[in-house]
């Protein structure tokens, strides 16, 4: 369909209709439409309609296909990383050592230096290097709130492996909130606790915390301590984007 | 590129290369390549390389784009539904009434009637009609195992609403296992219990269980009791698919 | 799938992903991208020979729908299906930057 | 995005999603699909006017890349981006069946 030719819209529609005729039969693996000779008279059975509606509701509720990327996602994202606040910081003293959780705090001024405005943030990942593990364990990530309460973010089964392995959690929403907020903000990684709790010890060892006692937060192993990997639109590019909001 | 013309592969490659030149500059919002006049001599800083590698690892670990649909997904999926076993069935007697959980069991012979072979299953959803709710609550879905143990499947925050609302959980893997397995299999929906547990009562009311006392499993409200919505390749279509495995 | 596994090892004439390595220095004359030195961009090429109303051959057309016109387009076209991003390192003045470019590497194609 | 919100309410000449309602009985002569009676299939149409090496216009070309050739194709093409499935009810013999057909409804288009 080059710009030089006039497009025959009716022909295109006719071709599309014919293509759909074939597509539906092909998807159903039918060589031709099924005969209606045996179809019982009257309306469709209730149960069939209920099933059809359930299926249709699913379509309406959760589109089976992923949403197309917004315009801003076309442009390159600057990647930065912010390391967890070292564990000798006094912030850690507020939280009792416990066998079922470890805490990770981040300096929001560092976050804001990397991402000056919350709207620029495209993705934030919490990266943890977990050491080799003997048994599979289900862990949970919580986001800290100022009033010493914690909001559940993610659950994840961590498989047993003979090697260390990076774990990645999408924490975009949490970081987005922090960019508008306080000074030091944190995450908690906990063992999954069942209501009829037995042993809720966090078996998963995260690099950056000594493995002697879970709560005894100690020296960080170099660059491999927990960090936030941030992807954001650089400020100058964002200004450019805003000024070209008109379509074409 | 019609079938009639010979394709000049070199020209296409040249056009693609030129297009990429524009694409990269455009994604970076650069009108021309940046000058290298101020670039300090020597290799890239350690921290920059570490950051580059972290980003590259992400690409390797989790492709940013969804995987294309396998051939079988092109074809239509037959939709069926299997209702939860009525609560007066003796299977429910084995599980103590509790304030933090409800149980849902399914007859695997019914599942097998709908999906004769596990390989045919494309998707299975557990659908629960939850009644209006005053406070948001985090709930968890578990899959039952023969030895009265439960495996965590999903966590979900259920928001407070003035209306009833359908909840949907992807339970494809569980149903896949059941199609090869026992006679009656089940799920457990529980309140999320924290390790420093306070009140772990399940506030979420599911249609099909009386609301008087959580564990007092009673009359089912018609077709709206919990059910499994199954999408599967019909057996005859699957045979067709297997026989046409060759490419074109 | 019309992916690198299939297409790079076959002589497929129809729509397929084709191999293309871009060396930033050689192909684009660029020295300003410090990492990587190049990347496998690849591209999609080949006809989607869809016969839209040839009734005599209908069963054959139906069998080929999945490959040649799964989206029931009026004029199907060979385009990327699975894409991957590309991280790059470059300098702005004296400051090194790591940036991620979305949808840069073509892993598979489709008639759409 | 070149989606139904934008395209149906504009006179866009370039690549866009176009409205098309298929009535199974009227358009296809089919009485065998019992539900739905028809559906909004829509389709993609319009040129992707990418000028691939016109250096004089380079800054303009760059600004239009996002729209006209985001995938840096050698010959960009207007194709579906977001698609949705369609559930149908039909009879095989005396037995009613509910089936879900994937990727039947075009919600948005892109130059690819």
């Amino acid at each position: 369909l080059s710009t030089c030719k006039t497009i025959d819209m009716e022909l295109v529609k006719r071709k599309r209709i014919e293509a759909i005729r074939g597509q539906i039969l092909s998807k159903l693996r039918l060589a031709s439409p099924p005969s209606q000779g045996e179809v019982p008279p009257g309306p469709l059975p209730e149960a069939v309609l209920a099933l059809y509606n359930s299926t249709r509701d699913r379509v309406a509720g959760e589109s089976a296909e992923p949403e197309p990327e917004p315009e801003a996602d076309y442009y390159a994202k600057e990647v930065t990383r912010v390391l967890m606040v070292e564990t000798h910081n006094e912030i850690y003293d507020k939280f009792k050592q416990s066998t079922h959780s470890i805490y990770m705090f981040f300096n929001t001024s560092e976050l804001r230096e990397a991402v000056p405005e919350p709207v620029l943030l495209s993705r934030a990942e919490l990266r943890l290097l977990r050491l080799k593990l003997k048994v599979e364990q289900h862990v949970e990530l919580y986001q800290g709130y100022g009033n010493a309460s914690w909001r559940y973010l993610h659950g994840r089964s961590v498989r047993a492996t003979a090697d260390d392995e990076w774990l990645s959690f999408d924490v975009t929403d949490a970081v987005h909130q922090w960019l508008s907020g306080g000074e030091i903000e944190g995450f908690r990684l906990s063992a999954h606790c069942s209501c009829d709790s037995r042993d809720n010890t966090l078996q998963v060892d995260i690099n950056g915390f000594t493995t002697g006692r879970r709560g005894d937060l100690a020296t960080i192993h170099g660059m491999n301590r927990p960090f936030l990997l941030l992807m954001a639109t650089p400020l100058e590019r964002a200004q450019h984007l805003q000024s070209s909001r008109h379509r074409r | 590129l019609s079938t009639c013309k010979t394709i000049d592969m070199e020209l296409v490659k040249r056009k693609r290369i030129e297009a990429i030149r524009g694409q990269i500059l455009s994604k970076l919002r650069l009108a021309s390549p940046p000058s290298q006049g101020e670039v300090p001599p020597g290799p890239l800083p350690e921290a920059v390389l570490a950051l580059y590698n972290s980003t590259r690892d992400r690409v390797a670990g989790e492709s940013a784009e969804p995987e294309p649909e396998p051939e079988a997904d092109y074809y239509a999926k037959e939709v069926t539904r299997v209702l939860m076993v009525e609560t007066h069935n003796e299977i429910y007697d084995k599980f103590k009434q509790s304030t933090h959980s409800i149980y849902m069991f399914f007859n695997t012979s019914e599942l097998r009637e709908a999906v004769p072979e596990p390989v045919l299953l494309s998707r299975a959803e557990l659908r629960l009609l939850r009644l209006k709710l005053k406070v948001e609550q985090h709930v968890e879905l578990y899959q039952g195992y023969g030895n009265a143990s439960w495996r965590y499947l999903h966590g979900r925050s259920v928001r407070a609403t003035a209306d009833d609302e359908w909840l949907s959980f992807d339970v494809t893997d569980a149903v896949h296992q059941w199609l090869s397995g026992g006679e009656i299999e089940g799920f457990r929906l529980s309140a999320h219990c924290s390790c420093d547990s306070r009140d772990n009562t399940l506030q979420v009311d599911i249609n099909g269980f009386t609301t008087g006392r959580r564990g007092d499993l009673a009359t089912i409200h018609g077709m709206n009791r919990p059910f499994l919505l199954l999408m599967a390749t019909p057996l005859e279509r699957a045979q067709h698919l297997q026989s046409s495995r060759h490419r074109r | 799938a019309l992916d690198t596994n299939y297409c790079f090892s076959s002589t497929e004439k129809n729509c397929c992903v084709r191999q293309l390595y871009i060396d930033f220095r050689k192909d684009l004359g660029w020295k300003w991208i410090h990492e990587p030195k190049g990347y496998h961009a690849n591209f999609c090429l080949g006809p989607c020979p869809y016969i839209w109303s040839l009734d005599t051959q209908y069963s054959k057309v139906l069998a080929l729908y999945n490959q040649h016109n799964p989206g029931a387009s009026a004029a199907p076209c060979c385009v990327p299906q699975a894409l991957e991003p590309l991280p790059i390192v470059y300098y702005v003045g004296r400051k090194p930057k790591v940036e991620q470019l979305s949808n840069m590497i073509v892993r598979s194609c489709k008639c759409s | 995005a070149l989606d139904t919100n934008y395209c149906f309410s504009s006179t866009e000449k370039n690549c866009c999603v176009r409205q098309l309602y298929i009535d199974f009985r009227k358009d296809l002569g089919w009485k065998w699909i019992h539900e739905p009676k028809g559906y909004h299939a829509n389709f993609c149409l319009g040129p992707c006017p990418y000028i691939w090496s016109l250096d004089t216009q380079y800054s303009k070309v760059l600004a239009l890349y996002n729209q006209h050739n985001p995938g840096a194709s050698a010959a960009p093409c207007c194709v579906p981006q977001a698609l949705e499935p369609l559930p149908i009810v039909y009879y095989v013999g005396r037995k009613p069946k509910v089936e879900q057909l994937s990727n039947m409804i075009v919600r948005s288009c892109k130059c690819s």
Partner: antibody
């Protein structure tokens, strides 16, 4: 290769009974409806009835001309189709074909036919 | 029941000819019209189903068309092997019914 082979035809007196068989091979028998069609000498083809496939519960359907006198059945373990004919009349004389029926309303494969003559 | 009428009961043609056999239904049959070939030895074969779809293995010189109540079968470039009787059949409404047949002979 799909193959249908009828047998059991012959001479029968009016009022008598006869059973025809059709052995099927080359396809999954239970997936298909199976049908009987007849053709009196020098006349047109006439559909007699069919027996449905497994998903449709192997139920039967007959034309008005034979309903109550003819019965179609199938042995799925041996892939054999049967036509039991009772109270035969002279006008039932014909070549009887078994045919595989598809959901599209057509018969895609036919047997070679077996001849029935009803005469005293 | 739906009546199927093939007005021409026999037809003469020469080898290489193009000829058309028609069939009419007593009501609209929504394209559920099929054509069969019966050879002199009694062998019956499906040629065309759903008005115009060629059954596998059938030569492309056979084609079908029509809609509503009127349908036709066309044989282009007639060959000796095509000498047979041709029947139409509707698959729209039970009971399935056949036309009276058109016998094709060589001049």
């Amino acid at each position: 290769e799909v193959k249908l082979v009828e047998s059991g035809g012959g001479l029968v007196q009016p009022g008598g009974s006869l059973s025809l068989s059709c052995a099927a091979s080359g396809f999954t028998f239970t997936d298909y409806y199976m049908s009987w069609v007849r053709q009196p000498p020098g006349k047109a083809l006439e559909w007699l009835g069919f027996i449905r496939n497994k998903p449709n519960g192997y139920t039967t359907e007959y034309s008005a001309s034979v309903k109550g006198r003819f019965t179609i059945s199938r042995d799925n373990s041996q892939s054999i189709l049967y036509l039991q004919m009772n109270v035969l009349r002279a006008e039932d004389s014909a070549t009887y074909y078994c045919a595989r029926y598809t959901g599209g309303g057509y018969f895609d494969y036919w047997g070679q036919g077996t001849t029935l003559t009803v005469s005293s | 029941d739906i009546q199927m009428t093939q007005t021409t009961s026999s037809l003469s043609a020469s080898l290489g000819d193009r000829l058309t056999i028609s069939c009419r239904a007593s009501q609209d049959i929504s394209n559920y019209l099929n054509w069969y070939q019966q050879k002199p030895d009694g062998t019956v074969k499906l040629l065309i189903y759903y008005t115009s779809r060629l059954h596998s293995g059938v030569p492309s010189r056979f084609s079908g068309s029509g809609s509503g109540t009127d349908y036709s079968l066309t044989i282009s470039n007639l060959e000796q092997a095509d000498i047979a009787t041709y029947f139409c059949q509707q698959g729209d409404t039970l009971p399935w019914t056949f036309g009276g047949g058109t016998k094709l002979e060589i001049k």
